[in-house]
Interface confidence: low
Amino acid sequence: APVRSLNCTLRDSQQKSLVMSGPYELKALHLQGQDMEQQVVFSMSFVQGEESNDKIPVALGLKEKNLYLSCVLKDDKPTLQLESVDPKNYPKKKMEKRFVFNKIEINNKLEFESAQFPNWYISTSQAENMPVFLGGTKGGQDITDFTMQFVSS
């Protein structure tokens, strides 16, 4: 059965938007006015995985692109990457674990925890124009809280 998906944008808790930086990287920076059109639109798919009231498994694809955020080990460190997939087979209900994030809602903010690497979160830096990455700390310097904006299909 078709996976259920919605289109959205994400901003970190400092209101930085996410934009493409080269073909396989996202960066976070403040955007205003017409520049807001640069922000990436995600296709968030609700996929199979452990689920509770405040934790929902999702996959984050780039709308109308065959690219998904995925979590892999690079030099023994959990790393966030944009991975190219076969568009005929994705998205699907049973996504491989590296594509799955636990969307956790706390106080109207969202965290995205890697299902593959528990306690590692999609993160942005305090600094402007830096890559979006997978971070192993919460509540520190790096930002792990996001808000989601619904985009009509």
Partner: antibody, heavy 125, light 112 residues
């Protein structure tokens, strides 16, 4: 045109089993979950469970767990609901219903967009 | 367990407005969409509202749905009541915590 056509009425004795069919047409059978809902005489709607025809995955309401089996045959685009150990309280109209997923900012849900005509199952000694 | 509670029956005169509430027993009603079905005697249910407030084509705009988070309830409102509105109405939602579908007990609408 989407259609869900169910099998005819059944009369069963207590302790027996019943298998109701639901033949789908007018859409891609594997692209939509199929649910079963029943309604006892003069009572409300009661959800029983679902099948994902694509992979046969099922989810059942706790009340029916162990007594209901929902299956899908993709070669004939037909879903089935089998209820065993029948008792008089199982006398009801049984509906199959196709589900449309709806998703939005606040959450998601099921929306039953097409229903079968219903199959009356009477359990009587 | 997630439950939806509806009044057993409501009655109103033709031309008036009626509101049928549907209250969630636990969790937030806003977390998952609420649907409303109309069922006339001897017929299968048909959808009159989906996604809290959306009307399928063919359903008149005098039928509307809403969510009130403060009372943790959904409501179906029918204005300009007609005798053909007399039917049973069921609310329904999806409990994402345990992947189950829940129906309210149903409300008989009597148009006096």
């Amino acid at each position: 045109e989407v259609q869900l056509v169910q099998s005819g009425a059944e009369v069963k004795k207590p302790g027996a089993s019943v298998k109701v069919s639901c033949k789908a047409s007018g859409y891609t059978f594997t692209s939509y979950y199929m649910h079963w809902v029943r309604q006892a005489p003069g009572q409300g709607l009661e959800w029983m469970g679902l099948v994902d025809p694509e992979d046969g995955e099922t989810i059942y309401a706790e009340k029916f767990q162990g007594r209901v089996t929902i299956t899908a045959d993709t070669s004939t685009d037909t879903a089935y609901m089998e209820l065993s150990s029948l008792r008089s309280e199982d006398t009801a109209v049984y509906y199959c219903a196709r589900v449309e997923w709806v998703a939005g900012t606040e959450g998601w849900g099921y929306y039953f967009d097409y229903w079968g005509q219903g199959t009356l199952v009477t359990v009587s000694s | 367990n997630f439950m939806l509670t509806q009044p057993h029956s409501v009655s109103e005169s033709p031309g008036k407005t009626v509101t049928i509430p549907c209250t969630a027993s636990s969790g937030s009603i806003a977390n998952n969409f609420v649907q409303w079905y109309q069922q006339r005697p001897g017929s299968a249910p048909t959808t009159v509202i989906y996604e809290d407030s959306q009307r399928p084509s063919g359903v008149p705009d005098r039928v509307s749905g809403s969510i009130d988070s403060s009372s943790n309830s959904a409501s179906l409102t029918i204005s300009g009541l007609k005798t053909e509105d007399e039917a049973d109405y069921y609310c329904q939602s999806y409990d994402s915590a345990n992947d189950r579908v829940t129906f309210g007990g149903g409300t008989k609408l009597i148009v006096l």
